[in-house]
């Protein structure tokens, strides 16, 4: 049978001779040269050669474990005389043993990492890793130990894990932000003769909110014209914060001062400035200077740094209101006046007053905007603002007159303002009442006395304060001997009643009744209206059957016998 141990070979052999691997040997070998050893398989005849007489195997070339860690070859032992095998063809392994020919290589040539400023000592920063191509199962060729070559006393590295940690207290980003740390990885467990590789770790301290905002000056002054509408920016203030990002974000607020209600401050998110704006309308003539206390604060604070003091600062802002030439201001936003409709021309209705609000108190002249009074019904005294009529009025034509009055500064005609005037025309009893409609009625020939044949109603264009009160009566010339009577109902209506039993249409087919309607106002107004009454033949139900269309009308307008 075959007699051999496992074959090992050190890689990277540098000797001038072939490297001895080992010996193939059969227990059938008597040492007389009768056996021939044959080598075949992986690298046989090229990498590995055998002395066919002795069975000694040699390697002809430098072998690299990283290229191939194991070679499997076949061995044969043949009787030279018979040519027959004395041993079965068998396989064996030549294992390439590792030497330390690979330095540790970091997975990255440069690492980048961040760690918050002011971190506690021992805070994890980053883990670096180096790999070694040598055999980790054989010796210490691949056992890597990490050490720090540059970056102390700020950082340290764990020798076994490659974990980099902070090593110094109170590292302040505002003082120094960037650190370059050089880490060495050395194999052979870090011992002498070990191979090494290095990497650079660029560490950036990230910001924490350890700095409050600070105003660069304690007082700011801005000017703004009194005409600035609400929302107008007046000026910008900026507190500086040594932090960055959200830690440097600043919110501004007005905390005190007489201008608390008059001004606002808004934060410009892009520039981190505070913009002072007008909140309410300003008036130079009322107040010329305002003082505000403005506060700048960090919205994102870190509780662990609150011991450093409040994360806010305040400054005084002085706002000077500048005078603007303003148009005259009327004493009212609108005027409501009233006048009787019977007012004579040049009757004064009332007056308007406007004043220049500026300190100069420029005199003012008044005028009527003729676009609003095309018929020139009204006029105004340009000096004192008195409004008077220039035409007669009629309430029944127009109850309200809406006109506009203009006040203009005499010294500066560009400065003018307008005010609406609402003039109400008051009623005067200048219209007589009259029938609400034309009345033509009929009476049956067989009508009985005191029978109601028509109800009368009246209308009046006037609008008395206490309402209409009309009275109805027959005209005096028709009152005596009339065939009909008027009954005043005292409710602004009246009834026409028959005065006799029966009417003959052949005798008198039509009656004309003159009715006087009076109002109860002052001065009393009255009118006379005529009611036509036709005599008709009726059925027994009182329904009209036939009437004469013609009426005998006397020159006086009264029918005979009315």
């Amino acid at each position: 049978s075959w007699m051999w141990n496992q074959f090992f070979l050190l890689e990277e052999y540098t000797g001038s001779d072939y490297q001895y691997v080992g010996k193939l040997h059969s227990d059938q070998d008597r040492g007389d040269g009768s056996l021939k050893y044959i080598l075949s398989g992986d690298g046989a005849g090229d990498l590995f050669i055998i002395n066919e007489n002795t069975g000694d195997i040699q390697a002809t070339k430098r072998l690299d474990r990283e290229e191939k860690p194991v070679y499997i070859l076949r061995a044969q032992a043949i009787n030279r005389r018979t040519g027959r095998p004395v041993e079965p063809e068998s396989e064996f392994i030549i294992k390439i043993h590792d030497i330390n020919d690979n330095e540790p290589i970091f997975t990255k040539e440069v690492y980048t990492a961040t760690v918050p400023e002011m971190s506690d000592v021992g805070t994890f920063v980053v883990q670096v890793t180096a790999t070694d191509a040598d055999d980790p199962t054989y010796g210490n060729s691949a056992k890597v130990v990490y050490s720090i070559l540059q970056g102390q006393p700020y950082f340290s590295v764990e020798s076994e894990t490659g974990i980099i940690k902070t090593a110094l207290l109170n590292m302040d980003r505002e003082n120094r932000e960037q650190y370059q740390v050089v880490i060495q990885a050395k194999d052979m467990g870090g011992q002498m003769g070990g191979l090494s590789g290095t990497t650079t770790v660029n560490i950036t301290l990230t910001d924490v909110n350890d700095n409050p905002p600070r105003f660069p000056q304690s007082t700011y002054q801005f000017k703004t014209p009194e005409s600035s509408p609400p929302g107008t920016p007046i000026g910008r203030i900026k507190a500086s914060d040594a932090d960055v990002g959200e830690n440097a974000e600043i919110e501004y607020s007005i905390t005190d001062g007489e201008g608390l209600d008059m001004f606002d401050v808004i934060t410009d998110q892009e520039t981190q400035e505070g913009i002072i704006t007008v909140k309410k309308l300003l008036d130079f003539e009322k107040k010329k200077v305002y003082t505000l206390k403005v506060e700048a604060s960090n919205p994102h604070v870190e509780p662990r740094f609150l011991y450093l003091g409040p994360f806010k600062d305040s400054a005084t802002v002085r706002i000077v209101v500048e005078d603007v030439d303003e148009p005259p201001v009327f004493s009212k936003l609108a005027y409501i006046l009233q006048i009787r409709e019977d007012a004579q021309i040049n009757t004064t209705i009332g007056s308007v007053t406007a004043q220049d609000p500026d300190a100069a108190r420029n005199p003012v002249k008044y005028s009527v905007d003729r676009h609003t009074d095309m018929d020139r019904i009204f006029n105004i005294d340009s000096g004192n603002g008195s409004i008077f009529t220039s035409k007669l009025l009629d309430r029944e034509t127009l109850l309200w007159h809406n006109i506009t009055v203009i006040a203009t500064e005499i010294n500066n005609p560009k400065q003018s303002s307008r005010v609406p005037l609402y003039i109400k025309v008051l009623d005067v009893n200048d219209n007589a009442p009259e029938f609400a409609e034309f009345y033509e009625t009929f009476v049956c020939e067989k009508a009985k006395a005191d029978q109601l044949i028509q109800t009368l109603r009246a209308v009046d264009k006037d609008d008395p304060y206490s309402g209409h009160q009309f009275s109805f009566s027959l005209a005096p010339e028709a009152a005596s001997g009339s065939n009909f009577t008027i009954q005043d109902n005292k409710d602004n209506t009246a009834g026409i009643l028959t005065r006799k039993n029966g009417y003959n249409r052949h005798e008198m087919s039509t009656y004309l009744l003159p009715v006087v309607i009076s109002d109860n106002d002052y001065p009393v107004q009255s009118s006379t209206g005529t009611v036509t009454v036709r005599v008709c033949a009726c059925d027994h139900h009182g329904n009209m059957q036939s009437c004469h269309a013609e009426a005998l009308i006397h020159p006086t307008g009264l029918s005979t016998g009315a």
């Epitope: 075949s40 398989g41 690298g43 191939k68 860690p69 068998s90 396989e91």
Partner: antibody, heavy 120, light 108 residues
């Protein structure tokens, strides 16, 4: 010419067994180490197992260790892969490949592959 | 143990040079082989021992290996070169490892 031809693939239930064969021709089969490599549908190549030229040495990927057995019959110029306790994740095309002398674990040539489907 | 990483895909215009990388720690110390696999076919060895071409493989295929990256280069890429490409090395003792594969697309 040098040729490898796999057979024995098919549909099998999880937990079942299958035996793949690889018939070699056109070269001295007994002089070469052989390998099995598989490829799941739409996925990359995964090495499965190795056997030395005379069958003295075998080696397996961790994913199949204890379940698959590689063997060869040099007299029949045939390589085998006995697969037991099959799982759904063993579904793949299985290739046999020759390890080329002097190339350092390079595979040339490869068989055309046989599909193994593990499904219930 | 070595882990091999390849880009999932690479695109190239016909006639241009395609470079497919295979990265792994200290890969330069290991022997790398490259295979081409076309759809429905078995893989074919195109480069062995980092930069050697088997007979029958066109001269436009070449390989290199340095640092942490091995590279397969196809100069003057042709439409027929469109395929999946795999790098391969040994992992530990007698085990073998493949890269995840790269799909090469020849545009146009």
């Amino acid at each position: 010419q040098v040729q490898l031809l796999e057979s024995g693939g098919g549909l099998v239930q999880p937990g079942g067994s299958l035996r793949l064969s690889c018939a070699a021709s056109g070269f001295t089969f007994s002089s070469y180490a052989m390998h099995w490599v598989r490829q799941a549908p739409g996925k990359g190549l995964e090495w499965v197992s190795f056997i030395s030229s005379l069958g003295s040495y075998t080696y397996y990927a961790d994913s199949v260790k204890g379940r698959f057995t590689i063997s060869r019959d040099n007299s029949k110029n045939t390589l085998y892969l006995q697969m037991n306790s099959l799982r759904a994740e063993d579904t793949a095309v299985y290739y046999c490949a020759r390890e080329t002398a002097g190339y350092g674990y390079a595979f040339d040539p490869w068989g055309q592959g046989t599909l193994v489907t593990v499904s219930s | 143990d070595i882990e091999l990483t390849q880009p999932p895909s690479v695109s190239v215009s016909p006639g241009q040079t395609a470079s497919i990388t295979c990265s792994g720690d200290n890969i330069r110390k290991y022997v790398v082989h490259w295979y081409q696999q076309k759809p429905g076919q078995a893989p074919v060895l195109v480069i062995y021992r980092d930069n050697n071409r088997p007979s029958g493989i066109p001269e436009r295929f070449s390989g290199s290996n340095s640092g942490n990256t091995a590279t397969l280069t196809i100069s003057g890429t042709q439409a027929e070169d469109e395929a999946d490409y795999y790098c391969q090395s040994w992992d530990s003792f007698l085990a073998v490892v493949f890269g995840g594969g790269t799909k090469l697309t020849v545009l146009g």
